[in-house]
Interface confidence: low
């Protein structure tokens, strides 16, 4: 099909455009170009007869058009009026006509824009500023840049007038920036020079430095004042309300007690007409006073509160020192000193942080010490412990249980048996116990200051016969070569002997096996997969003996280095590749394959039917044991030869 392509479609004024003809039919008599979407003799630009190779201008010919033998039309020195449609009329040798229409659009080359502003010195939080991008150009798009970034989203920024005007409402000092505008049309884009917005602001409340307010007699007083302001602020100093001088710094040498008082700095901005003041009270000491410690929290709660200890008074050019437990401060991430060493902060206090704490002020001759301060750290109660630890008693003996929980203030204790309150004492005594005294014995410890309570429950069994023991373990799934396992034979009983068996045999002698706690606890250090055996404990006294059920240790191990089978590495084209991967592991590992580094499936067997030389490469089996967190892998190179090219190749699976 005859088509016209405009190259380019969007043309800049003064440039040229080529109306390129595609799929021109064979056996042509000639062709003619027309301005517009139809054949109109009054709008003919140029005609061309192939036989004579003669081009004839038409009424719409401007002298800027060139027609080529392939029917394409070049228009030079494009003007705005050239925008629109162009129709090619082709006359074939059989005098059958064909037409095609193309078009292009003409745009002006944009001039460099500039920015005009309605307010060159806006005042912060008061004025608005409107920037306008000049000149106004038809069919142009306007863009804005702030510090060479596109406009941020802000309710104070508003575009109007077809984006030609950018308004900043309620300007702030942060609007002080470089602003540019850009004009764009399909053929050009131009940016303006920067306009820097100069926002008048301030003065803010001045700050007086240094911050310290205590000085010694004979020192120099040197105060400096600063307030954020544009233009920069003018400063005045007043002492006890009396004007001193119009400078940013106030200097008084060799001060005395009489220089104590209120010092005021006033900052003034002549453009905004605003004033702001700040007052500091200066105290001049005749001689260094005895220091003392103030605390922001006299009863801090353990693991919750921080405590800031401050050495008073604040004196300029003084060295502050601290001691804890009559020692210099230990290095600890929980101890922080302020820049001037005057404040010691204990982050997240513990019961061990009680002190005593002392601070000192160093002068030329000696160090003045404060009185010691002790922190009253509230803590606990911790989980109470019930002693003795026996859980098994014979009838007729006395039961005497004691409860203790670390706590400040000291805990209040209550005893419950099978959930029923018995007494509010630290000790529980029952004489001449019987089987009826078996039950759940609960000690409850309460801290009245923190309101916290903690309980511990102990099972007491009163019986003439020893119970069937059981084995508790501190680690049900230990990892090989990493973990230790402690088996404990329950219950703990008075006057009882504890025995152990492994796979029905008495304990082997091994440096990795250790008995403790009156043989009640058996510890296996650095377990191996060979420790996955049946463990039994036994208890006996003069009346009876009993054995636990066996506990089998489930040792997690692996994955070991995997093995890929079959071992063949050479295959014939067309064979099936069936690789199986195996790794010793507990639990069974997850398998995955990669071919030439590319992940395949998560299966133990990799099967590829009818392999070709394209299947050459490295086949890696990856094994991972999520329980041990360990991984392993092996790589095998597979070579596939075209059938019959190499003798002795495996036919595959």
């Amino acid at each position: 099909k005859l088509t016209i392509e405009s190259t380019p479609f969007n043309v800049a004024e003064g440039k040229e455009v080529l109306l390129l003809v595609h799929n021109l039919p064979q056996h042509l008599f000639g062709y003619s170009w027309y301005k517009g979407e139809r054949v109109d003799g009054n709008r003919q630009i140029i005609g061309y007869v192939i036989g004579t190779q003669q081009a004839t201008p038409g009424p719409a010919y401007s002298g800027r058009e060139i027609i080529y033998p392939n029917a394409s039309l070049l228009i030079q020195n494009i003007i705005q009026n050239d925008t629109g449609f162009y129709t090619l009329h082709v006359i074939k040798s059989d005098l059958v006509n064909e037409e095609a229409t193309g078009q292009f659009r003409v745009y002006p080359e944009l001039p460099k824009p500039s920015i005009s502003s309605n307010n060159s010195k806006p005042v912060e939080d008061k004025d608005a500023v409107a920037f306008t991008c000049e000149p106004e150009t038809q069919d142009a798009t306007y863009l804005w840049w702030v510090n060479n970034q596109s406009l941020p989203v802000s309710p104070r920024l508003q575009l109007s007038n077809g984006n030609r005007t950018l308004t900043l409402f309620n300007v702030t000092r942060n609007d002080t920036a470089s602003y540019k505008c850009e004009t764009q049309n399909p053929v050009s884009a131009r940016r303006s020079d920067s306009v820097i917005l100069n926002v008048l602001y301030g003065p803010d409340a001045p700050t007086i430095s240094p911050l310290n307010t205590s000085y010694r007699s004979g020192e120099n007083l040197n105060l400096s004042c600063h307030a954020a302001s544009n233009p920069p602020a003018q400063y005045s100093w007043f002492v006890n309300g009396t004007f001193q001088q119009s400078t940013q710094e106030l200097f008084i040498p060799n001060i005395t007690v009489n220089n104590s008082g209120s010092y005021t700095c006033q900052a003034h901005n002549s453009d905004t007409g605003l004033n702001r003041t700040t007052v500091t009270t200066i105290t001049v000491y005749a001689e260094p006073p005895k220091p003392f410690i103030t605390s922001n929290n006299s009863n801090p709660v353990e693991d919750e509160d921080a405590v800031a200890l401050t050495c008073e008074p604040e004196i300029q050019n003084t060295t502050y020192l601290w001691w804890v437990n009559n020692q210099s401060l230990p290095v600890s991430p929980r101890l922080q000193l302020s820049n001037d060493n005057r404040t010691l902060t204990l982050l997240s206090v513990t019961r061990n942080d009680v002190g005593p704490y002392e601070c000192g002020i160093q002068n030329e001759l000696s160090v003045d010490h404060s009185d010691p301060v002790i922190l009253n750290v509230l803590y606990g109660p911790d989980d109470p412990t019930i002693s003795p630890s026996y859980t098994y008693y014979r009838p007729g003996v006395n039961l005497s249980l004691s409860c203790h929980a670390a706590s400040n203030p000291p805990a209040q204790y209550s005893w419950l048996i099978d959930g029923n309150i018995q007494q509010h004492t630290q000790e529980l005594f029952i004489s001449n116990i019987t089987e009826k005294n078996s039950g759940l014995y609960t000690c409850q410890a309460n801290n009245s200051a923190s309101g916290h309570s903690r309980t511990t429950v102990k099972t007491i069994t009163v019986s003439a016969e020893l119970p069937k023991p059981s084995i508790s373990s501190n680690n049900s799934k230990p990892v090989e070569d990493k973990d230790a396992v402690a088996f404990t034979c329950e219950p703990e009983a008075q006057n009882t002997t504890y025995l152990w068996w492994v796979n029905g045999q008495s304990l082997p002698v091994s440096p990795r096996l250790q008995l403790s706690n009156g043989n009640r606890t058996l510890t296996l250090f650095n377990v191996t997969r060979n420790d996955a055996r049946a463990y039994v404990c036994g208890i006996q006294n003069s009346v009876s003996a009993n054995r636990s059920d066996p506990v089998t240790l489930d040792v997690l191990y692996g994955p070991d280095t995997p093995i890929i089978s079959p071992p063949d590495s050479s295959y014939l084209s067309g064979a099936n590749l069936n690789l199986s991967c195996h790794s010793a592991s507990n639990p069974s590992p997850q398998y995955s394959w990669r071919i030439n580094g590319i992940p395949q499936q998560h299966t133990q067997v990799l099967f590829i039917a009818k392999i070709t030389p394209n299947n050459n490469g490295t086949y890696a089996c990856f094994v991972s044991n999520l329980a041990t967190g360990r991984n392993n892998s092996i790589v095998k190179s597979i070579t596939v030869s075209a059938s019959g090219t190499s003798p002795g190749l495996s036919a595959g699976a």
């Epitope: 995955s592 590319i598 395949q600 499936q601 099967f607 039917a609 991972s624």
Partner: antibody
Framework: QVQLQESGPGLVRPSQTLSLTCTAS????????MHWVRQPPGRGLEWIGW????????EYAPKFQGRVTMLVDTSKNQFSLRLSSVTAADTAVYYC?????????????????WGQGSLVTVSS | DIQMTQSPSSLSASVGDRVTITCRAS??????????MHWYQQTPGKAPKLLIY???NLQSGVPSRFSGSGSGTDYTFTISSLQPEDIATYYC????????FGQGTKLQIT
């Protein structure tokens, strides 16, 4: 077994950002490209994009380019989808999925493991 | 983007009927000896389920009455003997470039 599970808020306000997380179990996401697909109510399936958890590389459908971000947390075996400046047209069931966990042939994206889907409604 | 045109958009058939759905890609989705066309089944309220991958491969666990064929731009999905549980919407999907799905075919039983 191999599973994917989407989670996130069911209601998002217009112009806000839609955030969903997909948690994988039974396999390691670092071995696979992980995808998001959505389905507006009563309409067909639309592929949104993929992330390679091994290196964080992403590729998004042109339709979502500029609004979509996909992130990964391999320590939790999770990946996530963030779609900004949402409108009512973003109301859909969002699925996370992955390709070819159970198939023998390696190829580009087809999806045989899908989450159950998470309906997200965009409304004020 | 490669556009997918799936037809018909809906169809009704009886139990035991042979059902065919076609999918045409705007350009070839075959390369390197593979045809990157896949077929899914989606029942209401559920996630799509892969039935056929790479034009003709039956996904593990999918009944053998489902099959697929085709290469280049034209692909066909067939259910040889329609069962009541096959009521669903079926989608084709290519993966030659960034994935796109067909608009779906809703299958009902008369």
């Amino acid at each position: 077994q191999v599973q994917l599970q989407e989670s996130g808020p069911g209601l998002v306000r217009p112009s806000q950002t839609l955030s969903l997380t997909c948690t994988a179990s039974g396999f390691n996401i670092k071995d696979y490209y992980m995808h998001w697909v959505r389905q507006p109510p009563g309409r067909g399936l639309e592929w949104i994009g993929w992330i390679d958890p091994e290196n964080g590389d992403t590729e998004y459908a042109p339709k979502f380019q500029g609004r979509v971000t996909m992130l990964v947390d391999t320590s939790k075996n999770q990946f996530s989808l963030r779609l900004s400046s949402v409108t009512a047209a973003d109301t859909a069931v969002y699925y996370c999925n992955t390709r070819g966990l159970s198939t023998m042939i390696t190829t580009r994206w087809f999806f045989d493991v899908w989450g159950q889907g998470s309906l997200v409604t965009v409304s004020s | 983007d490669i556009q997918m045109t799936q037809s018909p958009s809906s169809l009704s058939a009886s139990v035991g009927d042979r059902v065919t759905i076609t999918c045409r890609a705007s350009k070839s989705v075959s390369a390197s000896g593979y045809s990157y066309m896949h077929w899914y089944q989606q029942t209401p309220g559920k996630a799509p389920k892969l039935l056929i991958y790479l034009a003709s491969n039956l996904q593990s666990g999918v009944p053998s009455r489902f099959s697929g064929s085709g290469s280049g731009t034209d692909y066909t999905f067939t259910i040889s003997s329609l069962q009541p549980e096959d009521i669903a919407t079926y989608y084709c999907q290519h993966s030659r470039e960034l994935p796109t799905f067909g608009q779906g075919t809703k299958l009902q039983i008369t």
